[in-house]
């Protein structure tokens, strides 16, 4: 039960967390004008991963795309790359993490094939957190270079215009959604890996069984699944129980006190 | 279509308190700001202060400790009020929408308020 | 403050001439976000109230007729009326719209000559 509640809860705050990532790369704020130098304008920039914004007092906001790509700073490619690598591989987790879920049943999918499942999961969650992390660290750490290297006529936004205004940016809320979020991915993805021990089948739970054959006796020893790379099963491996030996293909799979939450 | 208009007492003594509504129509109070605007007999345009459709406010430094303005959406009003008047005050008062580039593109009509006992 | 200073305090000029009127502020009204001036120019005919001409520095109002138009960029700023009109007579004010307080220029009187 204690693994089905940590898998279960490893996917919830993963979904939060990955969710979290696509809000912060779609937002706006990864960059806001500091105002501490001019607390009284009437005209507030802030700029985000694909455009720039400028919200007038009277309420009016225009935004404007980054069209060029060349023209932009090799910094914002890369956080643009990471959090997207992220998102992906975020989103290839959940997927694999669904089918992976203990409470929910496909076919007559195996603990082992659902503990690797989980596994690979956890590990996307957990790249996918990093992803996040570095991408967001990398953003504040050229904010905050940028910050002291505000002066006129310098690269000072995102959008690599020329300013003839000292204007410095500081921290959006994107910066702080994404380290929530990465942080958020990643713990998901660590309860992934600790509820797959919990799923895979240790060799001690099984007993070696004698199976008389008439004439001659053969000891089959047991051949459990251990969290292994690949989501396929070896069909052909023997799994021994107290109650018999039987090929993996001919064992049925029934409802058992863990199954269901 | 959008319309302001200003109204008040005409004639507040020194050192009371200047009180003027400004009743909108044709847009809404919450996505626009509105100015208050005035203008000595003779002289130019001195902006007193705004409060946009969030409800912030902002005020020229030279009146801020004077001034205040709030606004009644239910009335569709915005009011001014500006304390311990004396003769300096004696102006047309206006009231505008501030609109895109915080530029003020509707005015009232203004009103003449004078200060004198 | 920023201190807008408009140049000259009075101008008179011929029916069908250019008009051309100055404003000048203390500190930069470039918006680096949107690289737009926040300067906007009203005219006040006598007894009325202000209206909009320009906002942008040179981004026309609808209805403004096309013989007005701004220019200039930073601190320093014109309104050109290219061939004035009887009805152009009055009072042009400049305003910074970039930071608060939104102080207004002292005014220009453009007469027919």
């Known amino acids: 039960m204690a693994v089905t509640a940590c898998q279960g809860l490893g996917f919830v705050v993963s979904l939060i967390g990955i969710a979290g990532i696509i809000a912060a790369t779609c937002m706006d704020q990864w960059s806001t004008q500091d105002l501490y130098n001019n607390p009284v304008t009437a005209v507030f920039n802030y700029q985000g991963l694909w455009r720039s914004c400028v919200r007038e007092s009277s309420g009016f906001t225009e935004c404007r795309g980054y069209f060029t790509l060349l023209g932009l700073p090799a910094m914002l490619q890369a956080v643009r790359a990471l959090m997207i690598v992220g998102i992906v591989l975020g989103a290839i987790g959940l997927l694999v993490s669904i089918f992976a879920l203990k409470c929910i049943r496909i076919g007559s999918m195996e603990d082992s094939a659902k503990a690797n499942m989980t596994l690979t999961s956890g590990i996307m969650f957990i790249v996918s957190g990093l992803c996040a992390i570095a991408g967001v660290s990398v953003f504040a750490n050229m904010l905050v270079t940028n910050f002291w290297m505000s002066t006129a006529n310098m690269y000072t936004g995102m959008g690599g215009m020329v300013q003839t205004v000292q204007t410095r940016y500081t921290f959006g809320a994107a910066l702080f959604v994404g380290w929530v979020a990465g942080g958020l991915t990643l713990i998901g993805g660590v309860m992934m890996c600790i509820a797959c021990r919990g799923l895979a089948p240790e060799e001690t739970n099984y007993k070696a069984v004698s199976y008389h054959a008439s004439g001659h006796s053969v000891a089959y020893k047991p051949g459990g699944f251990k969290a292994s790379t690949g989501f396929g099963s070896n069909t052909k491996n023997k799994k021994i129980y107290d109650g018999g030996a039987r090929t993996e293909d001919e064992v049925q799979s029934y409802p058992s006190k863990h199954d269901y939450v | 279509q959008v319309q302001l208009q200003e109204s008040g007492p005409g004639l507040v003594k020194p050192s009371e308190t200047l009180s003027l509504t400004c009743t909108v129509s044709?847009?809404?109070?919450?996505?626009?700001?509105v100015s208050w605007i005035r203008q000595p007999p003779g002289k130019g345009l001195e902006w007193i202060g705004v409060?946009?459709?969030?409800?912030?406010?902002n005020y020229h430094s030279t009146l801020i400790s004077r001034v205040t303005i709030s606004v009644d959406t239910s009335k569709n009003q915005f009011s001014l009020k500006l304390s311990s008047v004396t003769a300096a005050d004696t102006a047309v008062y206006y009231c505008?929408?501030?609109?895109?580039?915080?530029?003020?593109?509707?005015w009232g009509q203004g009103t003449l308020v004078t200060v004198s006992s | 403050d920023i201190v807008m200073t408009q140049s000259p305090d009075s101008l008179a000029v011929s029916l069908g001439e250019r008009a051309t009127i100055n404003c000048k502020s203390s500190?930069?009204?470039?918006?680096?976000?949107?690289?737009?001036?926040?300067l906007t120019w009203y005219q006040q005919k006598p007894g009325q109230p202000p209206k909009l001409l320009i906002y942008?520095?040179?981004t026309r109002e609808s209805g403004v007729p096309d013989r007005f138009s701004g220019s200039g960029s930073g601190t320093d700023f014109t309104l050109t009326i290219s061939s004035l009109q009887a009805e152009d007579v009055a009072v042009y004010y400049c305003?910074?719209?970039?930071?608060?307080?939104?102080?207004f220029g002292g005014g220009t009187k453009l007469e027919i000559k």
């Open positions: 505008a929408r501030a609109g895109r580039g915080n530029a003020l593109d509707y």
């Open positions: 044709g847009f809404s109070l919450t996505s626009y700001g």
């Open positions: 409060i946009w459709g969030d409800g912030s406010t």
């Open positions: 500190q930069s009204l470039l918006n680096s976000g949107n690289q737009k001036n926040y």
């Open positions: 942008w520095a040179s």
């Open positions: 305003q910074n719209d970039y930071s608060f307080p939104l102080t």
